[in-house]
Interface confidence: medium
């Protein structure tokens, strides 16, 4: 006779799956906070910084009541993909001033990539509809000056921090509804 059948496949506990995603998101939130503080120390921000290519904010107090897991994960993944692209761009085109943020910026990129893979895995484990492949995004124009790169870094890290902050709260809330 052939080899004995393997143990029955246990379907993953969605709350535990979500828990580990929350932990990763919290960890990335802390990393982003530290890097944003480092950037502020080295290059103090004068006022607010915006970048039109960044995703618009997806969550707020009012949106929490209507949150649904598929929508949150899909939107979060799309937004984080955009931030990953912006971090990559920052490392490549941000100028010599931003080299002082290495290796932390590289670590942030790697952890962001890891969270994205974790979200993808969570969506497949929970049998959520997979989003269509992302259309190729138009290339980001290089900053017009060294100061432009620094302003962009403030906008990217600030936006990522805010997105992750809301993501933690939203994921914690969704966990209670599973």
């Amino acid at each position: 006779p052939g080899p004995p059948p393997g143990p029955p496949r246990v379907s993953p506990d969605p709350r535990a799956e979500l828990d580990s995603t929350v932990l990763l998101t919290r960890s990335l939130l802390a990393d982003t906070r530290q890097l944003a503080a480092q950037l502020r120390d080295k290059f103090p921000a004068d006022g607010d910084h915006n970048l039109d290519s960044l995703p618009t904010l997806a969550m707020s107090a009012g949106a929490l009541g209507a949150l649904q897991l598929p929508g949150v994960l899909t939107r979060l993944r799309a937004d984080l993909l955009s931030y990953l692209r912006h971090v990559q761009w920052l490392r490549r085109a941000g100028g010599s001033s931003l080299k002082t943020l290495e290796p932390e910026l590289g670590t942030l990129q790697a952890r962001l990539d890891r969270l994205l893979r974790r979200l993808q895995l969570l969506m497949s484990r929970l049998a959520l509809p997979q989003p269509p492949p992302d259309p190729p995004a138009p290339p980001l124009a290089p900053p017009s000056s060294a100061w432009g790169g620094i302003r962009a870094a403030h906008a990217i890290l600030g936006g990522l921090h805010l997105t992750l902050d809301w993501a933690v709260r939203g994921l914690l809330l969704l966990k209670t509804r599973l």
Partner: antibody, heavy 117, light 110 residues
Amino acid sequence: EVQLLESGGGLVQPGGSLRLSCAASGFTFSHYDMNWLRQAPGKGLEWVGVISYDASNKFYADFVKGRFTISRDNSKNTLYLQMNSLRAEDTAVYYCARTPGSHFDYWGQGTLVTVSS
Amino acid sequence: QSVLTQPPSASGTPGQRVTISCSGSSSNIGNNAVNWYQQLPGTAPKLLIYYDDLLPSGVPDRFSGSKSGTSASLAISGLRSEDEADYYCSAWDDSLSGVVFGGGTKLTVL
């Protein structure tokens, strides 16, 4: 540097009205939900309410529902608290605070509202 | 009467470790993030701990937070005289659809 500066506090009679303002600077105001909180003299902190970043949603504590209204003008980077039908127990220092998620990461210095005849 | 329960006072000597507790229910601490605020005499509150145990920029790592079930705690190690302040725990409450606070704990450094 993030700054929140409240104004508009003062002495008002019971049943009267007052409008508080909170001028924000140093961050993209239109990206953040904003809150009002208060602290009666010698007492603890009390949350009054929150308005979403785009003003589409508002939540209030039960004790102010129907009497207080939170609004914002993103073009002026300003948050408001309209207080009507004021009572003696509304006497407190009122703070505005920014919310990036579940917490208040920056607070103003506060403005004192005294309700007394 | 506050929704979250904290001891009204706590004390310690310089260098000591002190812990402040905060208890709630499943609708607040059990299901939501706990945040801690420090209020020095005569000043506005300041965020000390968020999402149960994360430290904002500029807060020394002598401060730490933890949560288990429907209770949370704030620990301060290597106590200093400048830590003398009121400390408040806070969380969103699902049933009230709002933010709730503990009554505050007055910390005295002896």
